[in-house]
Structure formats: structure tokens, C-alpha cells
Interface confidence: low
Amino acid sequence: CPGACVCYNEPKVTTSCPQQGLQAVPTGIPASSQRIFLHGNRISYVPAASFQSCRNLTILWLHSNALAGIDAAAFTGLTLLEQLDLSDNAQLRVVDPTTFRGLGHLHTLHLDRCGLQELGPGLFRGLAALQYLYLQDNNLQALPDNTFRDLGNLTHLFLHGNRIPSVPEHAFRGLHSLDRLLLHQNHVARVHPHAFRDLGRLMTLYLFANNLSMLPAEVLVPLRSLQYLRLNDNPWVCDCRARPLWAWLQKFRGSSSEVPCNLPQRLAGRDLKRLAASDLEGCAVASGPFRPFQTNQLTDEELLGLPKCCQPDAADKASVLEPGRPASAGNALKGRVPPGDTPPGNGSGPRHINDSPFGTLPGSAEPPLTALRPGGSEPPGLPTTGPRRRPGCSRKNRTRSHCRLGQAGSGSSGTGDAEGSGALGIRKGNSADIQHSGGRSSLEGPRFEGKPIPNPLLGLDSTRTGHHHHHH
């Protein structure tokens, strides 16, 4: 056993050397080690094959060091590794794209607070068992297409607290099991209409504190299991282009935050969800300031699936441009109730599971709350009926909801063309999760403090300075 370490065999063969002032990975680590704890030291580099002899290693904690570099072959041979924690190494900045190759059993990877500026191509290739990926609080400035493509079992993806400006079409391709996606506190101004196409099991989506001024409702349609949606603290433009999102929100059955309008001035501070359809007329700004993705082929309109701006009739222009015009009283929505399910004479109606405006989705018997997991029975499939298209408002055909409201045949309730999520009535949380003492940062994962504590969710015993916790 290395001099600065404590080694013991029960409940797992463990080499524990936390907070010993180590400046390098110690030599002499027993080859039989199943767990190695090296956190809280001053290790600056992890050389190649540092742990190659430890073929049985399942947990490796290197967080809270001074790592500035990791050899691409540092983790060679660790085919049984399940937890790798590299967080809180702010000088790391770059990880070679081949560093994690061969870690086929890895289910938890912490790369949060590592100063990462980019995710190299293929960085997460082959990590088929990965369930938790922590990338929050870095300096990521892009989400390259297909970055997470191999992560078919990933349930939690934490990307909050970065500098991500947009979500391209294939950023989340392949994440069929994803339960929670945290993208808040970024610089996201644009989300590609198909960015969430594979996220049919997503239950929690946090997009608050970004730079979103509009969001095509088409983005949200695939999220048929969605239960928690946070869109607050964005500069929403509540004009005709917000109509599809408004209609989707009216049908959404889960828990959603306020969606406070930034523009037009007359609606500033009002909650988009509580506006009347008639409030969303005309154009808040004369020309679309939105250039979602650099391209020579497509216009803003085509990329966002929205017109640059709906052309108001002459009669509308005053109402759009006059900031002093009194706002509509709205639709007096209480709570989060869409008018789409309003029974005759009954007032507002509720939100529901799989409540897609496209038609009835196949239902399924609900398992007990404590057993319901995204990895369980397959959620209902997407409906086969598509949105009804009508002749539209400009040169191209558009849904009527993109046009001036109140035209004959358009309907003012917005439910006819509403695009909605068949949202499963499922909230975050699972009684299988275990909370341990501590708690340094929010919304994070499996770490524990003190003597080994069995974690029924992971099926392993782990000791850890408690600043991250599992959650579902």
C-alpha cells in the first residue's frame, strides 16, 4: 500500500489516499484494488497506463486535484470501471478524444468544473453503459452533432453553466433513454426544430436562463414523456411567431415555469402561457433578428420553421406598434390548464399524460411510483397523424397559426393546429435514490462521504466526499 494511502479489503478492495498533498499518482497501488480514491490532492498529470495493473477497478476518484493533462492511455485496461470522477480540475481544459475508449462498463462520468472548452469528436464513443454524464460548469461553447450518439443508456445529461449558444439538429442524437437534460444557464438562443427528436423518454428539460426569444413548438413535440419544463429567464418575443409555442403550452400536461414575455413592450413581463390567442398578433420586431445556424442555403424562416415575421393586416399594425395599447385580459388561465380540454360549460380543463394534440396516444398501465423508471416499459410511440396543414400566410404554405389570428376559419383558440407533447404524467424523483449528507452543488450525482455506504441504485459500496448526489 502506498505510504500516503490506507488500504483495506472490506467491503471492497480499496486504496484510499484523499487529501494527502500528493502531486502524482502514487506507485505501488495494489493490483487487486477495486476502488481508488485520490481526490483532494495536487496531482497535475495522469500518465499512460497509470492503473493498468488494476484490472478489477470499478471506482476511480480523481476529482479536486490540479489536473492539467491526462494521457490518452491513462485508463487503458480498466474494462470494469464503473465510476470515473475527474471533476473540479479547472486546469484540465482539454481531454483527448480517445481517453475513455474501452471503458465499456462505465456508468458515471464526472467532467464537471474542468474548464473544458470543447468536446472533441468521438470523446464519448463506445460508452454504451454510461448513465450519468456531468459536464456542467465548464466553458463549452458548442455542442457538436453526434457527440453523444453512442450513449443509448444515458439517463442524465448535465450541461448547465456553460456557454453553449445553440443546439444543432443532431446534438442529442441517440439519447433514447435520456430522463433529464439540464441546459439552463447557457447562452442558448436557438434550438434546431429536430434537436430533441430522439428524446422520447425525457422527463425533465431545463432551458431557463438562456437567450431564447422563440422556440418552435416542433422542438417539443417528440418529448412525449416530458413532465418538467423550465423556460423562464429568457427574452421571449410574444408575437405571432410565439403562437405555436403558446398552443403547445396550452396542451402540455406537466409542470412548466412561467414564460415571461420580453417583447412586445405592451406584453413585457406577462406570462406567455396566460395570454389570450388574440394577444399574439402581428410582429414585435420588423425583421427577424434570429440567424440560428450559419448556412447559405436556408433562411431563418426555413430553419426555425417559422416565418421571419407574420405580416399583419393594416388594421393590426397599430395594435402591434403602439406600446400604449392596453393588453388583452388574457384567458384567465389558472394554474397550468389548457383550453383544449375544456368541457362544455365547465371552465378550464387539465393537463394529461400523453396528451398530444395530434390524437390519442396508446396508453399503458402505470407502474407504482417507486418503480416507474425511464428504462422500464417502452413509452407510447409517436402518433401517426401529423399536424394538419392549411394554406398559409405567405409564399409558402404555413399552418394558420403563423398567420394573423382571427381570420375566418383560423379559429382563435389555437387548439386546432396546436403542436403538443404527449406528456407522460411523470415527475422527477425516485425513492430508490439515496440522499447522503453534504451537498456542494446542485443537480448532480453519485458521491458519498464517510465510511462506505451501500447505494441500492448503483449496487456498489462507495465512499466519497459528499458533494454530488444521485437523482432521477
Epitope: 400536461r253 390548464v337 396528451d355 404524467g425 424523483g429 425513492s431 432521477h472
Partner: antibody
Framework: QVQLQQPGIEVVKPGASVKLSCKAS????????MHWLRQRPGQGLEWIGE????????DYNQKFKGKATLTVDKSSTTAYMLLSSLTSEDSAVYFC????????????WGQGTSVTVSS | DIVMYQSPSSLAMSVGQKVIMNCKSS????????????LAWYQQKPGQSPKLLVY???TRDSGVPDRFIGSGSGTDFTLTISSVQAEDLADYFC?????????FGAGTKLELK
């Protein structure tokens, strides 16, 4: 196992405030919304509001806006409800309850704190 | 707000008997698109906090005995205890989990003869 621990009794004077606590354990605190409810003697349950412990986002019953303020302390995995300007009408048992995976279904409850407003 | 009405306010039964209690909502809790009813039932034993029994009108929570049967649709719901046991002495509340503000019925008190 999920546990929500609340103190048993609080006695306060009219016009005063009281801060009720709800200590959560046995699950990841920030992963579930926390709800607060009121039960007056011999009456049904009234929903006060809910808070997302991950970032303290709140949603209140309009009836209790200005009366109740929900907060959390993530480090101690404790939720709090501050009740202000108390009157005898506020005498009740106050429960915290964990929001389950199904939206607005309360799958675990604290034992409740009995608040008596009396001079 | 959705108003929940429960009946009867109390009932006295003998062990082994079948118990039926009702809950009515002021508006439909049924989704027109997925046929789910957003109603939950809770049991509150004397001096204790409520315990979840049923959600979506008929889905029993884990660990709840199968003698508790939820049914109903739209605005009319029923909780049936097929063969009441001594430990079932409690107040039973229905709750709509359709929208906020969450609302509850006034409760049905089950007493044993």
C-alpha cells in the same frame, strides 16, 4: 426510505411570523419538488404551493401568496415555509409532502407541524 | 379552481364488509386525448399524515393492498375497499392532480362498527 421530518408543535402570537421546517432524507433532495399543505382542525387539505429545490423556483396557490414563502437549504436538505402576519385563522397542521414522479401526486408526507396562533 | 366533493362524510362498517366512497369534481378530470383521469386517493389514519393509495383514478401505489380499488371517470370517482380491515380505520381524501392549485375533497371518515 424517504423521510420528511417536521417539528411537532409551534405556538406563535397573532401578527408574528413562523418558519416551519421539513428535513428530507432517504432520497436526493434536489430531485423532487416539495409541496406544502394546510389542514385545519376537522377539515380537508389545502394546497399552499410547491418549490423546486434545485433552484428554488416556486409555484403558489393564489390564496396563499403573501402569506406563505417557500425556501430550501440544499446543504441541509431542508425545506422551509415562512408564514407571516399570523391570525387565529392560520392555526392548523402544516404538512410538507414530496412531489412524486407523477405530476402533482404527493408520494411521501411529513408528520405535520401543528401551528397554534394564540395570544 | 376545481372543487372536489366527497360523500358520504362518514360511514361505519364491520370488518370484512365492502366499503364504497365517492368523489366528484366540478369539472372533468379526464383527458380527451389519453383517457387518463387525474385523480388520487389518500388515506390518513388518526394522528398521522396522509398516505398515497391511488393515482390516475385506478393505479395503486406500490405496497398498497389490492383490496383498495379506485375507479371512475370524468367527474365521478369511487374508492372501494373490497373487504375492510381494522387497520383501514382512517379518513380518505380524494385529490385532483389535474392542475394547480391542487384541491382535495373534505374527506370520508371510515369508522368500524
Amino acid at each position: 426510505q424517504v423521510q420528511l421530518q417536521q417539528p411537532g408543535i409551534e405556538v406563535v402570537k397573532p401578527g408574528a411570523s413562523v418558519k416551519l421546517s421539513c428535513k428530507a432524507s432517504g432520497y436526493t433532495f434536489i430531485s423532487n419538488w416539495m409541496h406544502w399543505l394546510r389542514q385545519r382542525p376537522g377539515q380537508g387539505l389545502e394546497w399552499i404551493g410547491e418549490i423546486d429545490p434545485s433552484d428554488t423556483y416556486t409555484d403558489y396557490n393564489q390564496k396563499f401568496k403573501g402569506k406563505a414563502t417557500l425556501t430550501v437549504d440544499k446543504s441541509s436538505t431542508t425545506a422551509y415555509m415562512l408564514l407571516s402576519s399570523l391570525t387565529s385563522e392560520d392555526s392548523a397542521v402544516y404538512f410538507c409532502a414530496r412531489g412524486g414522479m407523477i405530476v402533482y401526486v404527493l408520494d411521501s408526507w411529513g408528520q405535520g407541524t401543528s401551528v397554534t396562533v394564540s395570544s | 379552481d376545481i372543487v372536489m366533493y366527497q360523500s358520504p362524510s362518514s360511514l361505519a362498517m364491520s370488518v370484512g364488509q365492502k366499503v364504497i366512497m365517492n368523489c366528484k369534481s366540478s369539472q372533468s378530470l379526464l383527458s380527451s386525448n389519453n383517457q387518463k383521469n387525474y385523480l388520487a386517493w389518500y388515506q390518513q389514519k388518526p394522528g398521522q399524515s396522509p398516505k398515497l393509495l391511488v393515482y390516475f383514478a385506478s393505479t395503486r401505489d406500490s405496497g398498497v393492498p389490492d383490496r383498495f380499488i379506485g375507479s371512475g371517470s370524468g367527474t365521478d370517482f369511487t374508492l372501494t375497499i373490497s373487504s375492510v380491515q381494522a387497520e383501514d380505520l382512517a379518513d380518505y381524501f380524494c385529490q385532483q392532480h389535474y392542475t394547480t392549485p391542487l384541491t382535495f375533497g373534505a374527506g370520508t371518515k371510515l369508522e368500524l362498527k
